[in-house]
Amino acid sequence: CKAMHVAQPAVVLASSRGIASFVCEYASPGKATEVRVTVLRQADSQVTEVCAATYMMGNELTFLDDSICTGTSSGNQVNLTIQGLRAMDTGLYICKVELMYPPPYYLGIGNGTQIYVIDPEPCPDSDF
């Protein structure tokens, strides 16, 4: 297993609709054809997997049908979008990139993006 540098923004404020997008960029030492991207969430020292996708270079990322993540790839960059976020989902979202094929296997883990989520203000009741 060889180490690889992964860069991601330090902090992102989610939209009022609970959507956050960020780029995860990896310094590929070779010509990988198969890449796996995993998003981990760290909050209160607990780490959980949010979503993961394996893709062939030049193809779309395919997450599971019920995943809250979508993404696109371009060269050594992965554009990740996480939706359906609520205030309780605020936390550090860490991008993990694995170059699966061809060997050697490379692993890179970013420092994390703090995604801050604000629940929208409830609409005031209106009398007609």
Partner: antibody, heavy 118, light 108 residues
């Protein structure tokens, strides 16, 4: 090294607007956020809101909603805070601060005194 | 909104003494999202502690933070002359982010 340099002191009349700038250097500007905090003479710190330089999304203190606008210009690594319909109780030192991975404000501007007086 | 209440309002101590500052939140705050700052007259605040207990870069180890839930503490183990200042806690756990009203540490 990380630096935040703010614009100079301003004197404004009640009802006017003020726009304070905060020029960042020494780091990748759009990877972080910028928060604005003010301090009235002899008083404590009041959080005004923040902007994610990455996507331009903003979060304002309810008290200032409708009067404040925070923006960034990533081409010049500068953040701006505009406050409208100024009142005498808006007289304060206005600070910008970098919002980082742990959200806490590790870097601050030197402060800009805004005086509202007729 | 989460209200942070700091106590005492003023702490009168001598250099070399231990200072214990309290910050109480009106609702539970994740310890990941509590910070402490020091401010001297005419200066911008300076980050001391983030994540309730992690020291910021360049902060001497006489400063320590602890606590969870609604009760947080900043401790200065041995006061140095340059430590006499006003100290603020701040929470990021929920919007709006809020500061405590401050504790002034003055020379006795």
């Amino acid at each position: 090294q990380v630096q935040l340099v703010q614009s100079g002191a301003e004197v404004k009349k009640p009802g006017a607007s003020v726009k304070v700038s905060c020029k960042a250097s020494g780091y990748t500007f759009n990877s972080y956020g910028i928060s604005w905090v003010r301090q009235a003479p002899g008083q404590g710190l009041e959080w005004m809101g923040w902007i994610s330089a990455y996507n331009g999304n903003t979060n304002y203190a309810q008290k200032l909603q409708g009067r404040v606008t925070m923006t960034t210009d990533t081409s010049t690594s500068t953040a701006y805070m505009e406050l409208r319909s100024l009142r005498s109780d808006d007289t304060a030192v206005y600070f910008c601060a970098r919002v980082g991975r742990h959200l806490a404000f590790a870097y601050w501007g030197q402060g800009t005194l805004v005086t509202v007086s007729s | 909104e989460i209200v942070l209440t700091q106590s005492p309002g003023t702490l009168s101590l001598s250099p070399g003494e231990r200072a214990t500052l309290s910050c109480r939140a009106s609702q539970s705050v994740s310890s990941s999202y509590l910070a402490w700052y020091q401010q001297k007259p005419g200066q911008a605040p300076r980050l001391l502690i983030y994540g309730a207990s992690s020291r910021a870069t360049g902060i001497p180890d006489r400063f320590s933070g602890s606590g969870s839930g609604t009760d947080f503490t900043l401790t200065i183990s041995r006061l140095e002359p340059e430590d006499f200042a006003v100290y603020y806690c701040q929470q990021f756990g929920s919007s709006p982010w809020t500061f405590g009203q401050g504790t002034k540490v003055e020379i006795k």
